[in-house]
């Protein structure tokens, strides 16, 4: 962008605002809430945008926990804290001291306690099972021509590589994406799956973060696939740590 | 060419409000951000919040948060910087800039006194 | 907050000779692309001057002898031969999130 386009915006992220005085005189888009500068060139990370999100509260998500180990997002909408390079702090505290650990999607995987609690290291989440229902259709979708696009989705509208989406299955009308990504597999440059997935689940709600694009259009061999619910479970590198009372609950 | 032009100087009592006026011109006043800065007397200066004009998205310093209150009128081309409840320690020169923070025009400042 | 620390508090120099300010953030304000560091001089009863943007852009305007440099979280701000309208105070300040935290000062004054 140059200082020329009167009206820079960022096709990333429209929890931006844009302006023409970044380095040289070209456009520089700012987080809302953080004012962070981001790079329109690739998707912003969660935190960032949950964030932004924070500054226009909307209706929190509440998700279901389906064992011991996979996490889901319960808690629902926070201001989260964010790190200098837009990633989650491993330790999170709300207005009232209460404090509790996150992992790298922003997830709580601890007890909540208070402003003594310690969170040594944000854990990576390296597994990401993205759980979806479509809405009837006509008959099965093909599951190779499924596979085939909706890595398609994630390689060409979220920039992930293909080789982090690990597997697509399909059980009409269910339809199962698996994203994994070690530390050690991410380079620099690489998008987070976790980040991925925000996006993928933001998009299936018609909630899209995209500038000025239309919302997801998905279609299988030019078929409307519909997503009517959408479940996300988080598995991290280290178990999470809950108290045997939250496990027996 | 661009100019921000503040309002005059301003004597108020504790616990009163002041409003500094910021009239921009000479760019398109809707694109860019405006900065608010403090300075106390013979002190550095202090980040007090922004506005950006074309959708009236603010940010504020937490330290002035609910008591500084950041406006745009852009019929009007003009920012404003309210603070509430003065106190003796307000007493300083505000600033208005036209910037994210590398603020590269600034009004020519009001100086704002409290004092009973 | 992103602290930022000026160094010296003030700097005498001779006319012609060369003067360095510092300014050390207390978390890096740099992306592999570009440094969120400004610096600005201001005048007694003038507004603040932006000198350099970015770290190491010299505003248009600004004389050449001023040159900005650092990355990460230290920066220095030289000027390569000292004129007597170089007398201010200058300060560094950030923008890589809120609130964009200005360093303490340093006033430069002539030996």
């Known amino acids: 962008h140059t200082a020329a386009q009167d009206n820079c915006t960022c096709p990333t992220n429209k929890m931006t605002v844009c302006s023409p005085d970044g380095p040289g005189g070209r456009c520089q888009c700012r987080a809302l809430g953080s004012g962070v500068a981001v790079d329109c060139s690739t998707l912003t990370s969660e935190c960032l945008l949950l964030k932004a999100r924070m500054s226009a509260p909307k209706n929190a998500r509440t998700l279901v926990r389906p064992n011991e180990h996979a996490l889901v997002d319960n808690d629902g909408l926070y201001d989260p804290d964010c790190d200098p390079e837009g990633r989650f702090k491993a330790r999170q505290c709300n207005q009232t001291s209460v404090c509790w650990c996150v992992n790298s999607v922003g997830v709580r995987r601890t007890d909540k306690g208070d402003l003594s609690l310690r969170c040594d290291e944000l854990v990576r989440t390296h597994h990401i099972l993205i759980d979806l229902r479509h809405r009837p259709t006509a008959g099965a979708f093909n599951h190779s021509d499924l596979d085939a696009e909706l890595r398609r989705l994630f390689r060409e509208r979220y920039r992930l590589h293909p080789k982090f989406v690990a597997a697509v299955h399909y059980e009409q009308p269910t339809i199962q994406i698996e994203l994994r990504q070690n530390t050690s597999q991410k380079a620099a440059g690489d998008v987070d799956i976790g980040d991925a997935a925000y996006y993928f689940e933001r998009d299936v709600k018609g909630e899209s973060l995209f500038q000025g694009r239309g919302g997801l259009d998905l279609r299988v061999r030019g078929e409307p696939l519909q997503v009517e619910r959408t479940l996300i479970y988080y598995l991290d590198e280290i178990p999470p740590k809950f108290s045997m009372k939250r496990l027996t609950a | 060419q661009v100019q921000l032009v503040q309002s005059g100087a301003e004597v108020k009592k504790p616990g009163a409000s002041v409003k500094v006026s910021c009239k921009a011109s000479g760019y398109t006043f809707t694109n860019y951000w405006i900065g608010w800065v403090k300075q106390a007397p013979g002190q550095g200066l202090e980040w007090i919040g922004d506005i950006y004009p074309g959708g009236g998205y603010t940010n504020y310093n937490e330290k002035f948060k609910g008591r500084a209150t950041l406006t745009a009128d852009t019929s009007a081309s003009t920012a404003y910087m309210e603070l509430s409840s003065l106190r003796s320690e307000d007493t300083a020169v505000y600033y208005c800039?036209?910037?994210?923070?590398?603020?590269?025009?600034w009004g020519q400042g009001t100086l704002v006194t409290v004092s009973s | 907050d992103i602290v930022l620390t000026q160094s010296p508090d003030s700097l005498a120099v001779s006319l012609g000779e060369r003067a360095t300010i510092n300014c050390r953030a207390s978390?890096?304000?740099?992306?592999?692309?570009?440094?969120?560091m400004h610096w600005y001089q201001q005048k007694p009863g003038q507004p603040p001057k932006l000198l350099i943007k970015y770290a190491s852009n010299l505003e248009s305007g600004v004389p050449d002898r001023f040159s900005g440099s650092g990355s990460g979280t230290d920066f220095t701000l030289t000027i390569s031969s000292l004129q007597a309208e170089d007398v201010a105070v200058y300060y560094c300040?950030?923008?890589?999130?809120?609130?964009?935290?200005f360093g303490g000062g340093t006033k430069l004054e002539i030996k």
């Open positions: 978390q890096s304000v740099s992306t592999s692309s570009y440094s969120y």
């Open positions: 800039a036209r910037g994210t923070g590398g603020g590269d025009y």
């Open positions: 300040q950030h923008s890589w999130e809120i609130p964009y935290t």
